[in-house]
């Protein structure tokens, strides 16, 4: 009996530019002889419904169709037919199929590969064209993929130390697509500093599929309107 096992759940998520290993394990009732077996990896893009060959291993000879694609011949002996792709790109997401032939038997498995890019976040203070006592803080998130992203603003005062979400005076712009396929977006918070308590901590909170925990950038409102503590300047402002 010949069986192929791929990633549990049928989906693998990998960061952009990572050296990804797409799992494929072979289970066979007898010891594997790699000189008399064949492995073929296929890829079907998300954008066009055509399956193309990425890698082929047959009779101890291997052929890479994508630069750097490789199945370790050493690991193959113990049934590991995982495909390694260095420097994975957004466009290489899609369905990967591992086909194993141990004559006369054939087995295959498929997995969806999702390529994600984590956002980088920075805070900026924009005072251009603002009225007296009014400040505009911009939270820029850049280089993320997929497009779906959630940006919120929170504040913590000395009276209420638990974060409170701010819903007023927040404007989040449209997502902009970069040349490399990733996205950028900016969210703005308008503050009237005369109506806010000094010591209030404001946070821009970014949630994205690529992040295990939200990305937080913060600033503290001080008595002197625009002065920021050194730690805030160093850690959160570019």
């Amino acid at each position: 009996d010949l069986k192929v096992e791929m990633m549990a759940g049928g989906t693998q998520i990998t960061p952009l530019n990572d050296n990804v290993t797409i799992f494929c394990n072979i289970f066979y009732s007898q010891p594997l002889n790699i000189t008399s077996m064949g492995i073929t990896w296929f890829w079907k893009s998300l954008t066009f419904d055509k399956e193309v060959k990425v890698f082929e291993f047959f009779g101890d000879h291997q052929e890479a169709f994508r630069p750097g694609a490789i199945v370790s011949p050493w690991r193959l002996k113990s049934g590991d037919a995982s495909l390694r792709l260095p420097g994975i790109q957004l466009e290489e997401a899609g369905e990967y199929r591992c086909e194993v032939v141990v004559t006369p038997l054939k087995a295959q498995g498929t997995v969806q590969l999702e390529v994600v890019a984590s956002p980088a976040s920075r805070l900026l203070l924009d005072q251009v064209g603002m009225k007296e006592n009014e400040d505009k803080y911009m939270c820029e998130s850049s280089g993320f993929y997929p497009e779906a992203i959630n940006i919120t603003w929170e504040k913590q005062t000395q009276k209420f130390p638990h974060p409170i979400e701010i819903s007023e005076d927040v404007i989040t712009g449209p997502t902009i697509k970069n040349m490399d396929g990733t996205f950028n977006v900016t969210s703005c918070l308008k503050l009237n500093s005369s109506q806010e308590d000094p010591g209030t901590v404001y946070q821009c909170v970014v949630r994205h599929a690529s992040l295990h925990t939200p990305l937080r950038s913060n600033f503290t409102l001080t008595a002197a309107r625009h002065s920021l503590s050194e730690t805030e300047k160093t850690d959160n402002f570019s």
Epitope: T47, Q62, A64, F65, P67, G68, I70, S72, P86, E91
Partner: antibody
């Protein structure tokens, strides 16, 4: 038989652009990747980028982003690399290559010498 | 980027000699190491891939070994046609990088 035939030598002025070609045969071009590499006289090789002919998707070495631009013409099975804002540092032999048995650069073109001189 | 270092830039040997060319990576490249031969006319071909696997049609006098950061190419019985420059290349991480090359000459 897999073949990659590159265009002839180029003498160009600083600031100009040059477009090199790599005509292929012996394999299915539309589902292949073509890489470009640079070798300055008497020096080592540098990987510039690759292009997937099926979609035109590219992957660049950051060092060459903005300097090199890769394109393909599937009807003639030809890959192109345009090098812009040339300086004397760009004087080199440029190779096209495609992956094969175990290697990202298994089949090579004969190289094109580009000389940048005023 | 991963730096590849070939400490010997040129090497002189006699026909029939056993020649070893070494290559060091700036970090562990997990055996993703290929060797190329460049003839004086500029022609390039692959000799070895994945550290030790002989490319189709390459004579068996060529062999490769190594692990981690240190790798070597051995020519067991040097022939006239082996006069060339040899480059190592890491295939572990993009951008792919090459060693500076070792030029092999006849004594």
């Amino acid at each position: 038989q897999i073949q990659l035939q590159q265009s002839g030598p180029e003498l160009v002025k600083p600031g100009a652009s040059v477009k090199l070609s790599c005509k292929t045969s012996g394999f299915t071009f539309s589902s292949s990747y073509i890489s470009w590499l640079k070798q300055k006289p008497g020096q080592s090789l540098e990987w510039i980028a690759w292009i997937y002919a099926g979609t035109g998707n590219t992957n660049y070495n950051q060092k060459f982003t903005g300097k090199a631009q890769l394109t393909v013409d599937t009807s003639s099975s030809t890959a192109y690399m345009q090098f812009s804002s040339l300086t004397t540092e760009d004087s080199a032999i440029y190779y096209c290559a495609r992956p094969g048995e175990g290697s990202p650069f298994a089949y090579w073109g004969q190289g094109t010498l580009v000389t940048v001189s005023a | 980027d991963i730096q590849m270092t070939q400490t010997t830039s040129s090497l002189s040997a006699s026909l029939g000699d056993r020649v070893t060319i070494s290559c060091r990576a700036s970090q562990d490249i997990s055996n993703y190491l290929n060797w190329y031969q460049q003839k004086p006319d500029g022609t390039v071909k692959v000799l070895i891939y994945y550290t030790s696997r002989l490319y189709s049609g390459v004579p068996s006098r060529f062999s490769g070994s190594g692990s981690g950061t240190d790798y070597s190419l051995t020519i067991s019985n040097l022939e006239q046609e082996d006069i060339a420059t040899y480059f190592c290349q890491q295939g572990d991480t993009l951008p792919y990088t090459f060693g500076g090359g070792t030029k092999l000459e006849i004594k």
